[in-house]
């Protein structure tokens, strides 16, 4: 189970208006369901059941963009319509550049992630869990732009930085 | 590098209605947030409106409810529908490309040449 070092990058209002940016580090796990990969772009949450909708008039983003997922627990949703892999695969299929799973709440998601695939995704699949999914969704939470660089080496940074 | 050009400035009287749009061209990749910066004369220029790529916006509470910002990734192009125009809304008019640079862990700005509105009372 490799380490994934996720940089996301918060863009807020300053007093004056303009733009701001807030660096928050955090680690997750490359799953075996993506690739290895290097990635990055805007955040876009999205709810489990969102990817059920198979749509194909639904508007595909033009960008590459990370699909943040929180999944539910399993008792909340006893027969998903898609598996946890399946949920992947829709986001990619949808434009994802990559997608983070938090697993807090399922973590026998992480089994079935990293099951392997004949045909794993070409884009990297993510799990955070723990303090790690709380600071992420946090920030996703803020519905604000905030970005994602995923990377398979540390970040050269230090985690936290306020651009004033 | 990234490539601005606004058009779409001009003379308009109180309570009219201009809009500008600004083509990128470049290493689109960065353009993480284009945006539309003025700057009035003896003033600092001031961010009018910005826009990310999934559209989540950002307005100066001078315009909100008055000027509206879009894009069109596909274009690599954003708009600025000014409505209600003010005589303080007149400045130069600048489109930027807001990036993020993560080596250095500071955002960097590309800046277009700038186009004057003028609103006449």
């Known amino acids: 189970k490799e380490t994934a070092f996720v940089e996301v990058v918060l863009f807020e209002s300053s007093p004056s208006g303009d733009y701001t940016t807030h660096t928050t580090g955090l680690t997750g796990r490359f799953s075996r369901a993506g690739a290895m990969l290097s990635a990055e772009g805007e955040i876009v949450q999205m709810h489990p059941l969102g990817l059920c909708n198979n749509n194909d008039e639904e508007d595909l983003y033009e960008y590459g963009w990370v699909g943040v997922v929180k999944l539910e627990q399993p008792e909340l949703d006893p027969k998903p319509c898609l598996t946890v892999l399946g949920k992947a695969k829709r986001a990619v299929q949808r434009g994802a550049t990559a997608v983070i799973f938090d697993v807090s709440e399922n973590p026998e998601a992480i089994d079935q992630l990293n099951q392997g695939s004949e045909d794993p995704l070409k884009r990297p699949v993510v799990y955070v869990k723990g303090a790690d999914a709380i600071k992420l969704m946090n920030i996703v939470n803020k519905q604000k732009v905030a970005r994602a660089r995923i990377q398979h080496l540390p970040p050269r940074q230090p985690t936290e930085y306020f651009d004033m | 590098q990234v490539q601005l050009q606004e058009s779409g400035g001009g003379l308009v009287q109180a309570g009219g209605s201009l809009r500008l749009s600004c083509a990128a061209s470049?290493?689109?990749?960065?353009?993480?947030?284009m945006g539309w910066y003025r700057q009035a004369p003896g003033k600092e220029r001031e961010l009018v409106a910005g826009?990310?790529?999934?559209?989540?916006?950002n307005y100066a509470d001078s315009v909100k409810g008055r000027f509206t910002i879009s894009r069109d990734n596909a274009k690599n192009t954003v708009y600025l529908q000014m409505n209600s125009l003010k005589p303080e809304d007149t400045a130069v008019y600048y489109c930027?490309?807001?990036?993020?640079?993560?080596?250095?862990?500071?955002?960097?700005?590309?800046w277009g040449q700038g186009t004057q509105v003028t609103v006449s009372s």
């Open positions: 826009i990310s790529q999934g559209s989540i916006t």
């Open positions: 930027a490309v807001i990036s993020y640079d993560y080596i250095k862990s500071v955002p960097f700005r590309y």
């Open positions: 470049g290493t689109i990749s960065y353009a993480h947030i």
